[in-house]
């Protein structure tokens, strides 16, 4: 490590004094200090002498001696005060530039250490510092504004009390630059554009940044467009806007448009697609099957996607029957816009009733005409079952009628004892009827089937049960023969004696 003579950390002299600073190292040494007049430098191998025979306040500062060949990079320093009664400050720079949140050193060096107690920092002309200005002072280095903010870009003066009066330094201009967090922010509107040939169109590309130094351009299918730029400044951001106005669009205007902005941090781009069409269009579609089956009492949402240009002039949901002339309640119809040209229309049908099965149509209109999309809604019902005893062609027959949707399957059971419902332990015999006779099968209605079980003689201590089931559920009816005739047992209902 080099050694400085005199071997003191600070040296205080008067103006006009002779000052000699000698630095000695193992190898060659170099001096570094504030730029100031009247110094002469004399080097002799491993020592270097810095001297002046007429010190001025401008020689105030820290002088550092380094040994370039030292791998540890050691250095020694001495601070020189030249205490001029008329000049308490030596300002090393009149402009300081920092980024926001950095510490800003205002390099006004005190020329007399005795004055340290009475120093303060003010804005020019004795005005107070901006509120919340945190600063500290070092007589060797000056005032440091900590974590400087953009608003603190001001002109400052260092103030010292000398003999009861304030003496100001020359002013120091602080420029606090906004930190550029990245490439400029971009907006390109609209995000998508459709026009009929001959119509007017506008595309706006705008970019903003905390710093004014950035470029923005609009390109069409990789061709940069020459558009006049508008500039603005608000909300502490610089804005540059490019507006493309097309009075009468044609097919060559269609395609991809990109808004591109760049600064020192990099580049941002965003794109949109412009479609030019010959005439108005209106397309209806659904992601759902147009034929819907729902269990009675449950709910259903019917959804239609609409793609249209120009916008819709009208739309509605209509019930086309067959059960009643009721129409969907408007409050159950909902419209959401996915984007400018695509919309979703939803009809909510909560807790469906039998009379609400049928056809529902969504109709929409724009200058391109009318379009409709129709859903067919069939309700599913669990089977309802009834059994009667009759004679067909002279033979005793049990006749089971089952009604439901989808078409029910029928199974006959014979079991011992009198019971409302046969259980496994009681079952004597089971007959499946794979092809019951279909009595009625109309669209949107239940399917009614009939199954016949010919019984030569009714066993009086036994029960005959007709069971029907489909994908929704099952139903059954128990028939109990008694001596006076026969009893039928609908589940959980009264006995019936024909």
């Amino acid at each position: 490590i080099p050694v400085i003579e005199p071997s003191v950390p600070e040296l205080v002299v008067k103006p006009g004094a002779t000052v000699t600073l000698r630095c000695v190292g193992n190898g060659s040494v170099e001096w570094d200090g504030p730029p100031s007049p009247h110094w002469t430098l004399y080097s002799d191998g491993s020592s270097s002498i810095l001297s002046t025979n007429n010190a001025t306040f401008q020689n105030t500062g820290t002088y550092r001696c380094t040994e370039p060949g030292d791998p540890l990079g050691g250095s020694a320093a001495i601070h020189l005060y030249v205490k001029d009664p008329a000049r308490p400050w030596n300002v090393l720079a009149q402009e300081v530039v920092v980024f926001e949140d950095q510490d800003a050193l205002l390099p006004c060096l005190l020329t007399d250490p005795v004055l340290e107690a009475g120093v303060s920092l003010v804005r020019v002309r004795g005005r107070p510092l901006m509120r919340h200005t945190n600063y500290s002072f070092s007589p060797w280095h000056g005032f440091t504004i900590h974590r400087a903010k953009f608003i603190q870009s001001q002109d400052y003066q260092c103030s010292a009390l000398m003999g009861g009066r304030k003496v100001m330094s020359i002013s120091i201009r602080l420029k606090v630059q906004k930190v550029i967090p990245g490439p400029p922010a971009l907006t390109l509107v609209p995000a998508e554009l459709v026009r009929i040939r001959g119509e007017a169109a506008q595309i706006v590309c705008s970019a903003s940044s905390v710093d004014v130094n950035f470029d923005v351009f609009l390109q069409h299918n990789n061709t940069k467009l020459a558009i006049p730029q508008q500039s603005d400044f608000h909300n502490n951001r610089y804005q540059k806007v490019l507006t493309l106005n097309l009075d009468q669009v044609d097919f060559q205007h269609a395609g991809n448009y990109s808004c591109v902005a760049s600064n020192v941090q990099g580049k941002h781009s965003t794109s949109m697609f412009f479609r030019v069409v010959e005439s108005a269009y209106l397309n209806l579609s659904s992601e759902q099957n147009l034929i819907q089956e729902v269990t009675v009492g449950e709910g259903l949402n019917l959804k239609v996607m609409v793609e249209a240009y120009p916008g819709l002039q009208g739309f509605n949901w209509t019930y086309l029957g067959p059960f009643s002339d009721h129409q969907p309640e408007p409050k159950l119809a909902n419209a959401t816009t996915k984007d400018t040209y695509r919309h979703t229309f939803t009809l909510s049908l909560p807790r469906l009733k039998p009379s609400e099965a049928g056809r529902y149509s969504f109709l929409a209109r724009n200058p391109g005409g009318w379009r409709a999309l129709t859903f067919e809604l069939t309700l599913r019902y669990p089977p309802e079952v009834s059994v009667i005893w009759t004679f067909i062609n002279g033979s005793g027959t049990l006749l089971c009628a089952a009604s439901g949707y989808p078409q029910p399957n029928v199974t006959w059971l014979q079991c011992s004892g009198h019971t409302d419902r046969c259980d496994e332990a009681q079952v004597l015999q089971v007959w499946d009827d794979p092809y019951p006779e279909v009595l009625s099968q109309e669209p949107f209605h239940k399917v009614t089937v009939q199954s016949l079980l010919t019984v030569e003689t009714l066993e009086h201590n036994q029960t005959y049960e007709c069971r029907a089931h489909n994908s929704v559920g099952s139903g059954s009816w128990a028939f109990i023969p008694i001596s006076a005739g026969a009893h039928t047992h609908p589940p959980d209902e009264f006995l019936f004696t024909p």
Epitope: G126, R127, P128, R131, H132
Partner: antibody, heavy 120, light 113 residues
Framework: QVQLVQSGAEVKKPGASVKVSCKAS????????ISWVRQAPGQGLEWMGW????????NYAQKLQGRVTMTTDTSTSTAYMELRSLRSDDTAVYYC?????????????WGQGTLVTVSS | DIVMTQSPDSLAVSLGERATINCKSS????????????LAWYQQKPGQPPKLLIY???NRESGVPDRFSGSGSGTDFTLTISSLQAEDVAVYYC?????????FGPGTKVDIK
């Protein structure tokens, strides 16, 4: 609402000192500076100096330098002005005033004033 | 120091009439860096502290009636009361906050004729 409430009237002998207080309420005390302004009987207004309630930084009018000290107590949101070596021409109403929102030395709120009479 | 002078010393104006007060600074209080005039106007009624009316030479303080307006630039400024009301009887001061020490004018007393 913003209020600056000052201490009561004082009668002092020449050569004595006086310390006037100014209690602030209704705003964040440390966000604004306080100036002191005085008005001799029947006379105009004279700015005495300012203090930053944020960091205690002060700037006094040159003619009062060495005789005036301004301080703040942020725990009680109170500003103080002490004037030493009183003379008869220091007889005046002393006002504390809040610096403007802009941090410039004009005043949007004032205390009610404290009459200091210096008389032998 | 910047010396502020006001004219007239006093004036009497009929109710509903216009009152005009002038203020002159010994050097410009226009800051070229922000193009602002560092001048304020205050109203002081007897036994009360001053009340801020105008700042930056022409900006009316919140809650101040719009009959009060300020104008001027550089060294010459004017406070105008467009239609004097009884409650406007007071002493009016201009103040420069351009440079330390921040000085006030001597005041202009406004009365009703």
């Amino acid at each position: 609402q913003v209020q600056l409430v000052q201490s009561g009237a004082e009668v002092k002998k020449p050569g004595a000192s006086v310390k006037v207080s100014c209690k602030a309420s209704g705003y964040t005390f440390t966000s604004y500076g306080i100036s002191w302004v005085r008005q001799a009987p029947g006379q105009g207004l004279e700015w005495m100096g300012w203090i930053s309630a944020y960091n205690g930084n002060t700037n006094y009018a040159q003619k009062l330098q060495g005789r005036v000290t301004m301080t703040t107590d942020t725990s009680t949101s109170t500003a103080y002005m002490e004037l030493r070596s009183l003379r008869s021409d220091d007889t005046a109403v002393y006002y504390c005033a809040r610096e403007s929102w802009f941090g410039e030395v004009f005043f949007d709120y004032w205390g009610q004033g404290t009459l200091v009479t210096v008389s032998s | 120091d910047i010396v502020m002078t006001q004219s007239p010393d006093s004036l009497a104006v009929s109710l509903g009439e216009r009152a005009t007060i002038n203020c002159k600074s010994s050097q410009s209080v226009l800051d070229s860096s922000d193009n602002k005039n560092y001048l304020a106007w205050y109203q002081q009624k007897p036994g009360q502290p001053p009340k801020l009316l105008i700042y930056w030479a022409s900006n009316r303080e919140s809650g101040v009636p719009d009959r009060f307006s300020g104008s001027g630039s550089g060294t010459d400024f004017t406070l105008t009361i467009s239609s004097l009301q009884a409650e406007d009887v007071a002493v009016y001061y201009c103040q420069q906050y351009y440079s330390d020490p921040f000085t006030f004018g001597p005041g202009t007393k406004v009365d009703i004729k």
